[in-house]
């Protein structure tokens, strides 16, 4: 080991200067007694090295790169050795940015997986290894006073979401939640969310079904459809409102929305539709009047209206 590089900082802000020193030991006797130390950044030779002999006989070259504009590069010091360049030492230089404040943090409570799933936007590329940690604590009040800390949630590499398992959650009690981003140039924290996991619950949608025709029931009127839905059982005790959407299967018509419908309606007659037309229908629900998130739309149900001309055009429902 004839040479050794030391740098002012191996990781810097992109565009910042960096100073490096290369020292060649005196006992490298096979070398030229007054060797010329050369610098190379990546494949490019870098002028501007200031070389001096130190009192102990070692040779030192110092270089200042005014702007490191590469996000990653190798800096090496070398000597001319015959017809080739003999590399004495090299260091990896990294340049990038400190992490921006993570934003748009939001969470959903999934009652099936029993976990609180939080996601965020990490902000612009830092060009440096940056870790994200979802941090949280339990709070009795409005998150001004911090209770027990909850185990940090660390997402898999490259992911901007993390799941806090049920054992770390307290339902019907507020939690403070935020994201911390960290790399070699700094740390940033998102604004804190204060939420009760149940207030961000996302339910599963009901299953739409065709209403079984019963002998005593009148058949659907022209331009009407009779349908029913089966609520998602684990969410049955949560008060909800639902909405239905429908559109003709053919053509470019957009979805028409019907609602709000009470989850408990369970059956519904939808009128004012085109006769003899196949329709696609979907339903979704949300916890209500308490806070929550809309469920996904249910799988589609496809139904056809009767042949005759429609007699009236309005929505109504039967309990």
């Amino acid at each position: 080991e004839c040479g050794h590089i030391s740098v002012s900082a191996p990781i810097v802000h992109l565009g910042d200067p960096i100073t490096a020193s290369c020292i060649i030991k005196q006992n490298c006797s096979h070398l030229d007694p007054e060797p010329q130390i050369l610098w190379r950044l990546g494949a490019e030779l870098q002028p501007g090295g200031r070389q001096q002999r130190l009192s102990d006989g070692t040779q030192e070259s110092i270089i200042t790169l005014p702007h490191l504009n590469h996000t990653q590069a190798f800096l090496s010091c070398a000597l001319n050795w015959g017809n080739s360049l003999q590399i004495l030492d090299q260091v990896e230089l990294r340049a990038g940015y400190p992490p921006a404040i993570p934003h748009n943090l939001s969470c959903l409570m999934n009652l099936t997986t029993s976990s609180l799933i939080c996601q965020w936007e990490p902000g612009p590329e830092t060009h440096l290894p940056t870790s994200f940690t979802l941090k949280s604590f339990k709070s009795r009040g409005n998150c001004q006073t911090q209770g027990d800390s909850i185990l940090d949630c660390v997402p898999k590499d490259g992911q901007s979401h993390c799941s806090i398992p049920r054992k770390h959650l307290l339902l019907y009690q507020n939690m403070g939640i935020w994201v911390q981003a960290e790399n070699a140039l700094g740390t940033s924290m998102s604004p804190q969310l204060c939420l009760d996991p149940m207030d961000v619950v996302k339910l599963e949608p009901p299953m739409l079904r065709t209403m079984d025709p019963s002998p005593e029931a009148a058949p659907p009127q022209a331009g009407c459809l009779q349908l029913s839905w089966e609520p998602w059982q684990p969410g049955l005790h949560i008060n909800q409102k639902c909405e239905l959407r429908h559109k003709p299967q053919r053509g470019e018509a957009s979805w028409a929305l019907v609602g709000p419908l009470p989850l408990e309606a369970l059956q519904y007659e939808l009128c004012g539709l085109l006769p003899a037309t196949a329709y696609t229908l979907q339903i979704r629900c949300i916890r209500w009047p308490l806070p929550g998130h809309w469920s996904d739309w249910s799988p589609s149900l496809e139904l056809r209206t009767t042949e005759r001309a429609p007699t009236h055009h309005h929505h109504h429902h039967h309990h």
């Epitope: 609520p231 684990p234 049955l236 008060n239 009470p262 408990e264």
Partner: antibody
Amino acid sequence: EVQLLESGGGLVQPGGSLRLSCAASGFTFSLYWMGWVRQAPGKGLEWVSSISSSGGVTPYADSVKGRFTISRDNSKNTLYLQMNSLRAEDTAVYYCAKLGELGQYMFWGQGTLVTVSS
Amino acid sequence: DIQMTQSPSSLSASVGDRVTITCRASQGISSYLNWYQQKPGKAPKLLIYYASNLQNGVPSRFSGSGSGTDFTLTISSLQPEDFATYYCQQSFYYPFYFGGGTKVEIK
């Protein structure tokens, strides 16, 4: 403070009828599912029936289906259980309970004893 | 129907003991498992809901764990007032079934 007060229990002959009531106070009755759970002497707990907040959904245990009817009057904050065609095996303490959003029985009444015997 | 099997049906323990009661569902119920305590002549009382959430006012020596089909109620240090019968109940799907109960008696 949540309070549930059952009434209407007593001695009835097999084949007879009885109507249990549960008066609720201390919470917004119309927002919660309610239910009945019974316990035969010296036995465990048995779910009987539940009713949704507006009364539209009413599941029943197979053992009482077709004989018992659960209902509620949200204007009176009262839950009911109409019990017809009573059998000896219906003898139990009947508890009225308020359900939570996750199906848990959050609060229970003190119970009313129904004895079916000739 | 989802059947609930509770074990043991009874146990004897001393004040200060750690007590564990298990409940097994005949099929997966996610975390929809609740635990109740009942003392003779009294109505049941909710202890734990959704497998691990402590009901307000219940001492922290009670805890619940598990998901899917296997669940546990633990009393970390048994107190004199804890001698009672404990029931589990699934609330994932109707009909709601209770476990057969576990009677915790003084040794």
